[in-house]
Every structure is written in structure tokens, then in C-alpha cells.
Amino acid sequence: ARSEDRYRNPKGSACSRIWQSPRFIARKRGFTVKMHCYMNSASGNVSWLWKQEMDENPQQLKLEKGRMEESQNESLATLTIQGIRFEDNGIYFCQQKCNNTSEVYQGCGTELRVMGFSTLAQLKQRNTLKD
């Protein structure tokens, strides 16, 4: 819909859409994982949230220096975690706050499972149910 040049049109807000991938990662302990967020444009800073359990509220991710790194250029934001540990298990969300509208958009989440708690088959089955 049109705003008739009276106000910034939310439809035209450059960060009104955000795609996160992959939806699920299963890796053995010690591996490096990357998760990505794709945005319409770099019109707002991206931060990363994390929650351990499905029914928890996501919290701001505390980046562990030297092991966790976030990067953003243009319309791609990436979170890299090196040497993954069991305590990294959980769901990671990227979140973008629009510079002009202050509206916040959140990705659908990437679930990370560090191998060792269950078999790969069980994890795959869980992912199918989740989707």
C-alpha cells in the first residue's frame, strides 16, 4: 500500500525481510559451523540471539572472543563458531534493527546440535518433526 509521501512506508523498509539458513546444523564436537542471515539490504545492524531450549526466550548471544565471530557486509550477516562444544547446543536467531523505523526483524532460527547427545538419525527425525 502507498503512504502518499506522508511517512516512511513500512512496505519499502529495506530490512523488512530477513532469511536465515540453515534451519538445522548437526556437527561433531570441535568442528566449525557457520550460519547466515540474508537481508534486503544493510539498512540496520544485525545482532545474534541464542536460546538453549525450545520454550525459552532468546537472549543476546555473548560472543566468546577468538571462538565466536560475527560479520556483516551488505545484505549478508554470518555467525561463525569454531571448536563447537556441547554447551553451544541451542537455537540461534539473527535480528536486525532498522536504522530509520526502529522496527526489529528476526530470522526463523538455526538449531545447532553438537553430536554426542544422540544419534544423527534421531536428530534428523527431530528436524523433520520441527519443520
Partner: antibody, heavy 113, light 112 residues
Framework: QVQLVQSGAEVKKPGASVKVSCKAS????????VNWVRQAPGQGLEWMGM????????HYNQMFNDRVTMTVDTSTSTVYMELSSLRSEDTAVYYC??????WGQGTLVTVSS | DIVMTQTPLSLSVTPGQPASISCKSS???????????LNWLLQKPGQSPQSLIY???KLDSGVPDRFSGSGSGTDFTLKISRVEAEDVGVYYC?????????FGGGTKVEIK
């Protein structure tokens, strides 16, 4: 010509809900955002939120703490604004407006016990 | 939220004389695409508001050219070159660059 015709005045008790309607005519209904603005007696203007009639996308003013809901009926070119958990401070004239350019005549909502 | 501050609160003007209303925003209203969503409304006694000016200086259709808007960033002005009796009412500036949309407190213009 563009017209926004609102429903009549309402008197409500604290804690109740009110639903105000706004019927649009004279233009392609789904082409423009519809905003809701309220004005308490003798006071200024306060933006409540807006809705895109083409897909029902809404943007609300957070100060209303999830008390406001805007909906649309494209078959009748009507937008609705519902405000719940009413309190005396919600006594105001409620306006629907097309992009704050064309305005409805206003609906007085009085909240009183 | 963006705070819009209007001055003066009220204005008493002799017909045919100029009038000026100031509007200041707590943050710049220039958006990333180069547009400044600063608008002016007039609410005549007992009526719904009517739009006068949008994008700082563009006059709405039917608005007399004695009205003009100017400004940039955070400082804006509405001018009436020669006030007429029909110009009485409360003038509001409002911004549409940042959500939520916010209005100034209003300036009441009356005729001496």
C-alpha cells in the same frame, strides 16, 4: 470523492472493549494504508497504528501495550480498530485516516463507570 | 520516540499580517533515501484535522499559496504570509520518518 465514514459514538465501562469501524469510498481501498489517530478532549493528536488493507499488515504504537487490534474487511472496504481493557484515559475522539491525508469525521468513545 | 516541540503555544494575529510557527524534532527527520517526512495539519474548531503540507514544503491540493513550509534536519517552520479569518485553528506538525509517528503539541492561531 474520497470519503471515510466512521461508526457512531460509544459509551463504555472501564475494562470493556470498543470496536470502531471506518468505511472507505471514492478510491481503490487496497492501495493505501489506513491509520488510526486519537485525540483526548482538549488535547493533541496521538498515532495508534496503521493497517495495509491489501494484506492486513499492521504496525502499532507500542504505547498501547497490545490493547489495540486493527482488522480489515475488503468486501465492504471497511477497517476496524478495537481497543481493549478500556480505562478513563481512553476517552477520546478516534479518527481513521488515509495516510493522515484524508480524515474520517471521528468517533467519540467515552469510558466511564 | 521522536519528540516534536512546537512554538509558540498560541498566536494572535491581525488579519493580513504574517504568522510563523516553529517545529523542532528530537532527531533528524532525514531518512536514508533522502526524504524528510515532516508534515503540517490544521484542525479548525469542531472539525477533523486537514492536511496542509507534506515533505516539509509541498502544499496539498486546495491549500492556498499563502502557506509555506521550510526547514531541514530537526528545525522546521510553517509560515502564513497573510493570515485570513478562515486560518484560525490549531496547527500540528508531525513526523513520519521514525515509528511511531508523532505529533507536535499544537499551536493555536486566533485572529485579533
Amino acid at each position: 470523492q474520497v470519503q471515510l465514514v466512521q461508526s457512531g459514538a460509544e459509551v463504555k465501562k472501564p475494562g470493556a472493549s470498543v470496536k470502531v469501524s471506518c468505511k472507505a469510498s471514492g478510491y481503490t481501498f487496497t492501495d493505501y494504508w489506513v491509520n488510526w489517530v486519537r485525540q483526548a478532549p482538549g488535547q493533541g493528536l496521538e498515532w495508534m497504528g496503521m493497517i495495509d488493507p491489501s494484506d492486513s499488515e499492521t504496525h502499532y504504537n507500542q504505547m498501547f501495550n497490545d490493547r489495540v487490534t486493527m482488522t480489515v474487511d475488503t468486501s465492504t472496504s471497511t477497517v476496524y480498530m478495537e481497543l481493549s481493557s478500556l480505562r478513563s484515559e481512553d476517552t477520546a475522539v478516534y479518527y481513521c485516516t488515509r495516510s493522515n491525508y484524508y480524515w474520517g469525521q471521528g468517533t467519540l468513545v467515552t469510558v466511564s463507570s | 520516540d521522536i519528540v516534536m516541540t512546537q512554538t509558540p503555544l498560541s498566536l494572535s494575529v491581525t488579519p493580513g499580517q504574517p504568522a510563523s510557527i516553529s517545529c523542532k524534532s528530537s532527531q533528524s527527520l532525514l531518512d536514508s533515501e533522502g526524504k524528510t517526512y515532516l508534515n503540517w495539519l490544521l484542525q479548525k474548531p469542531g472539525q477533523s484535522p486537514q492536511s496542509l503540507i507534506y515533505l516539509v514544503s509541498k502544499l496539498d491540493s486546495g491549500v492556498p499559496d499563502r502557506f509555506s513550509g521550510s526547514g531541514s534536519g530537526t528545525d522546521f517552520t510553517l509560515k502564513i504570509s497573510r493570515v485570513e479569518a478562515e486560518d484560525v485553528g490549531v496547527y500540528y506538525c508531525w513526523q513520519g520518518t521514525h515509528f511511531p509517528l508523532t505529533f507536535g503539541g499544537g499551536t493555536k492561531v486566533e485572529i485579533k
